[in-house]
């Protein structure tokens, strides 16, 4: 707490300008009116204040707005945003995307801080859903943002927002997240033709069920091995050798290099060795000829 001292004669601030950077801590406290500061917040960001000076300015705003800052002030916080705690931010009601962008810009190039995470959470909750413009903005600043959300949170993403998602935005998503995102992507891109559809849906295929993979195998999509390796194991296992061959096209040769890794390893174990041999890749580990394959899951279902 800065002790209250009278402002020296002639030092009372008439406006927020660069002369204030020469004020000592106590002079800023005594000579800058909080209401003046609030109305001229847009000027603060242009002035190279030290962290000590920014602390004093924040203290003034806290006293003026104990229940939380109005959006007119928040939008112009600039570098002062870095001084805010998550507790401060929880008091805010941020509704404008422009305000969000302005504050994210201050933190640009840094990892998502607790302050930024709180700000985003407040903003998205206030909007009720993660709309396209918001998602566009957030993934532009934080490509991994989407994958930081829980499956429950992702369920509030409308299919129309999926258009804003870039492949790199999904790099760190796990299968549970892709399970939620894939049906939304399928819906969003449903009116596209075959090749264009595949380009768009490819990043989301880690959430695709078997029947969708079977359908894709009929469309000459030539899926690359990197995408294939990210598919759900349970979705790949029922695919026949012929379907995988059609799905991968010329990339089928890459299976050999991946034969010890999931889902390829598990898929090989489910195929007849005869069928695997037709690929001519030397894949080993399939079901030997003459063996009877019982689908126990089907038997359990019948009983």
């Amino acid at each position: 707490e800065v002790e209250k001292t009278a402002c020296p004669s002639g030092k009372k601030a008439r406006e927020i300008d660069e002369s204030l950077i020469f004020y000592k801590k106590w002079e800023l406290e005594a000579c800058v009116d909080a209401a003046l500061l609030a109305t001229q917040m847009d000027r603060v960001n242009a002035i190279p204040f030290t962290y000590e000076q920014l602390d004093v300015l924040k203290h003034k705003l806290d006293e003026l707005y104990p229940q939380g800052y109005p959006e007119s002030v928040i939008q112009h916080l600039g570098y002062l945003f870095l001084k805010m705690s998550p507790e401060d931010i929880r008091k805010w009601n941020v509704t404008s995307l422009e305000t969000l962008k302005a504050l994210l810009e201050v933190n640009k190039g840094h990892e998502m801080s607790p302050q930024v995470a709180t700000l985003i959470d407040r903003f998205v909750k206030g909007r009720g859903q993660l709309d396209k413009d918001t998602l566009d903005t957030l993934t532009a600043f934080y490509p991994g943002y989407l994958c930081s959300l829980s499956p429950e949170e992702l369920s509030s993403v409308p299919p129309s927002s999926i258009w804003a998602v870039r492949p790199q935005d999904l790099d760190t998503c796990d299968p549970r997240q892709l399970d939620v995102l894939y049906p939304k992507a399928r819906l969003a891109f449903q009116n596209m033709n075959g090749s264009e559809y595949f380009v768009k849906i490819q990043s989301f295929l880690g959430g695709a069920p078997t029947e969708d993979l079977k359908a894709l195998s009929q469309q000459n999509v030539s899926m690359d091995l990197a995408t294939f390796m990210k598919l759900r194991t349970d979705a790949v296992l029922p695919l026949t050798v012929a379907e995988v061959q059609k799905l991968l096209g010329p990339h089928v040769e890459g299976l050999k290099a991946e034969e010890r890794h999931r889902p390829v390893r598990d898929w090989i174990l489910r195929q007849r060795q005869d069928d695997l041999d037709t690929l001519g890749l030397g894949l080993q580990g399939g079901i030997p000829n003459g063996y009877l394959v019982l689908d126990l899951s089907m038997q359990e279902a019948l009983s």
């Epitope: 660069e18 950077i21 020469f22 000592k24 801590k25 002035i47 190279p48 204040f49 030290t50 962290y51 000590e52 000076q53 602390d55 570098y79």
Partner: antibody, heavy 119, light 110 residues
């Protein structure tokens, strides 16, 4: 290559003046606050002053007007003008980039230039 | 005035030892503290900023902690190349400052 190179050091008589330069390459000096720091032989680091991105200058309390920091953005160069030099000003003088627009840690240093004040 | 006091002024330790250096500010500087390493005849090098963030390229055996007035630099397992003088510096204010740096701690290898 990002670097700061100081020059202008040498032997100078007490009471005389000297101007040190710090030339930057690979970075735009106008985007950062810049500082001067010195180190007397066998002693610790001593902060001299800083010039922020707007050209405002701040000095350590002991400087008392004898040193002046300036910058020429068109030449991407920082300067330290020293006057009324004394024997105790003998030191290696470093320029350093401040990781902020105003004041903060020094994340890039020059190699230093030695100033010897002696008659 | 903001003053920085470092201790000890020197220490000697063996390779593999855990080494701790402290820095005290005369008044709160929150977490705005940096640590530097300086080897003889060389310019200082930034090790840690904002009290605990490791600068780019600095080995993970270096760590920093503290906030307010009391700060610590720790070398978890001392290596031969860590023989140097270490300085702290406040990055909170540039007014009322006699010296932004602490007095330094010389670390020698036994």
């Amino acid at each position: 290559q990002v670097q700061l190179v100081e020059s202008g050091g040498g032997v100078v008589q007490p009471g005389r003046s000297l101007r040190l330069s710090c030339a930057a390459s690979g970075i735009d000096l106008s985007s950062y606050a810049m500082s001067w720091v010195r180190q007397a032989p066998g002693k610790g680091l001593e902060w001299i002053g800083v010039i922020d991105i707007s050209g405002n200058r701040f000095y350590a309390d002991w400087v008392k007007g004898r040193f002046t920091i300036s910058r020429d953005n068109s030449k991407n160069t920082l300067y330290l003008q020293m006057s009324s030099l004394r024997a105790e000003d003998t030191a290696v003088y470093y320029c350093a980039r401040v990781d902020s627009r105003a004041w903060g840690p020094f994340n890039l240093w020059g190699q230093g230039t030695l100033v010897t004040v002696s008659s | 005035d903001y003053q920085m006091t470092q201790s000890p002024s020197s220490l000697s330790a063996s390779v593999g030892d855990r080494v701790t250096i402290t820095c005290q500010a005369s008044q709160s500087i929150f977490s705005y503290l940096a640590w530097y390493q300086q080897k003889p005849g060389k310019a200082p090098k930034l090790l840690i900023y904002d009290a605990s963030d490791l600068a780019s390229g600095v080995p993970s055996r270096f760590s920093g902690s503290g906030s307010g007035t009391d700060f610590t630099l720790t070398i978890s397992s001392l290596q031969c190349e860590d023989a140097a003088t270490y300085y702290c510096q406040q990055g909170y204010t540039r007014s009322d400052v006699d010296n932004a740096f602490g007095g330094g701690t010389k670390v020698e290898i036994k």
